[in-house]
């Protein structure tokens, strides 16, 4: 628990506790917001983001968003609360230890997004089909 000498505060989303009152450590994520990227037609890419930030709220996970349009390719890396949509999409894979890209429907661009919950997991973004969650080995990793 938060020890007695640490004040309790009302309506506090900076602290996440389990049923026993244990405190959750926050996630460490790559956090460069939106940057131009050279990642294209690859099974996986590194983010090339040099900033690893402490997520503001312990419930937040790491997110990466890859977008391609007629003009450029961008990669966005952030922390985000999986209970809230991001770019109008639910973070379905927030419990995954790896950031496995899933395509989302967005008019006028190709849009992939992934989320994950191990330290700096949005540094390595995976597009390859072999990592798809239909793979039973990956499901074992995620739910162990």
């Amino acid at each position: 628990t938060i020890p007695p000498h640490v004040q309790k505060s009302v309506n506090n989303d900076m602290i996440v506790t389990d049923n026993n009152g244990a405190v959750k450590f926050p996630q460490l994520c790559k956090f460069c917001d939106v940057r131009f990227s050279t990642c294209d037609n690859q099974k996986s890419c590194m983010s090339n983001c040099s900033i690893t930030s402490i997520c503001e709220k312990p419930q937040e996970v790491c997110v990466a968003v890859w977008r391609k349009n007629d003009e450029n390719i961008t990669l966005e890396t952030v922390c985000h609360d999986p209970k809230l949509p991001y770019h109008d999409f639910i973070l379905e894979d927030a419990a995954s230890p790896k950031c496995i890209m899933k395509e989302k429907k967005k008019p006028g661009e190709t849009f992939f997004m992934c989320s994950c919950s191990s330290d700096e997991c949005n540094d390595n973004i995976i597009f390859s089909e072999e990592y798809n969650t239909s793979n039973p080995d990956l499901l074992l990793v995620i739910f162990q």
């Epitope: 020890p3 026993n20 402490i54």
Partner: nanobody, 124 residues
Framework: EVQLLESGGGLVQPGGSLRLSCAAS???????RMWWVRQAPGKGLEWVS?????????YYARSVDGRFTISRDNSKNTLYLQMNSLRAEDTAVYYC?????????????????WGQGTLVTVSS
């Protein structure tokens, strides 16, 4: 017995600097990621900075990045936080905390994971 003892807090003017220390004992310091966590009056905990046990890789909250510097001296079992360009919103009690590799939750012990804290007041 595990102990974490913070010191170095005090009253400082906006734009000023302070250096906090956390003396650790009763555990193998070099096995733990160490954190600085703060709590402003009436607010929740804010995770300010962390440093890896070996290699001194560091992490910061966006609110302090570029102003605060975390460091550790493993030979002295001591954690530090150099705070520069202090602002009124940095006023808080600052705690050090320890985290084992891969540990997601902080267990239910008053002194195993937290120090008593040191008060930093930024005011003119």
């Amino acid at each position: 017995e595990v102990q974490l003892l913070e010191s170095g807090g005090g009253l400082v003017q906006p734009g000023g600097s302070l250096r906090l220390s956390c003396a650790a004992s009763g555990f193998t310091f070099t096995e733990y990621r160490m954190w600085w966590v703060r709590q402003a009056p009436g607010k929740g905990l804010e995770w300010v900075s962390a440093i890896e046990p070996i290699g001194n890789r560091t992490y910061y909250a966006r609110s302090v990045d570029g102003r605060f510097t975390i460091s550790r001296d493993n030979s002295k079992n001591t954690l530090y936080l150099q705070m520069n360009s202090l602002r009124a919103e940095d006023t808080a009690v600052y705690y050090c905390a320890k985290q084992m590799p891969g540990q997601k939750w902080m267990a239910k012990s008053r002194f195993d994971y937290w120090g008593q804290g040191t008060l930093v007041t930024v005011s003119s």
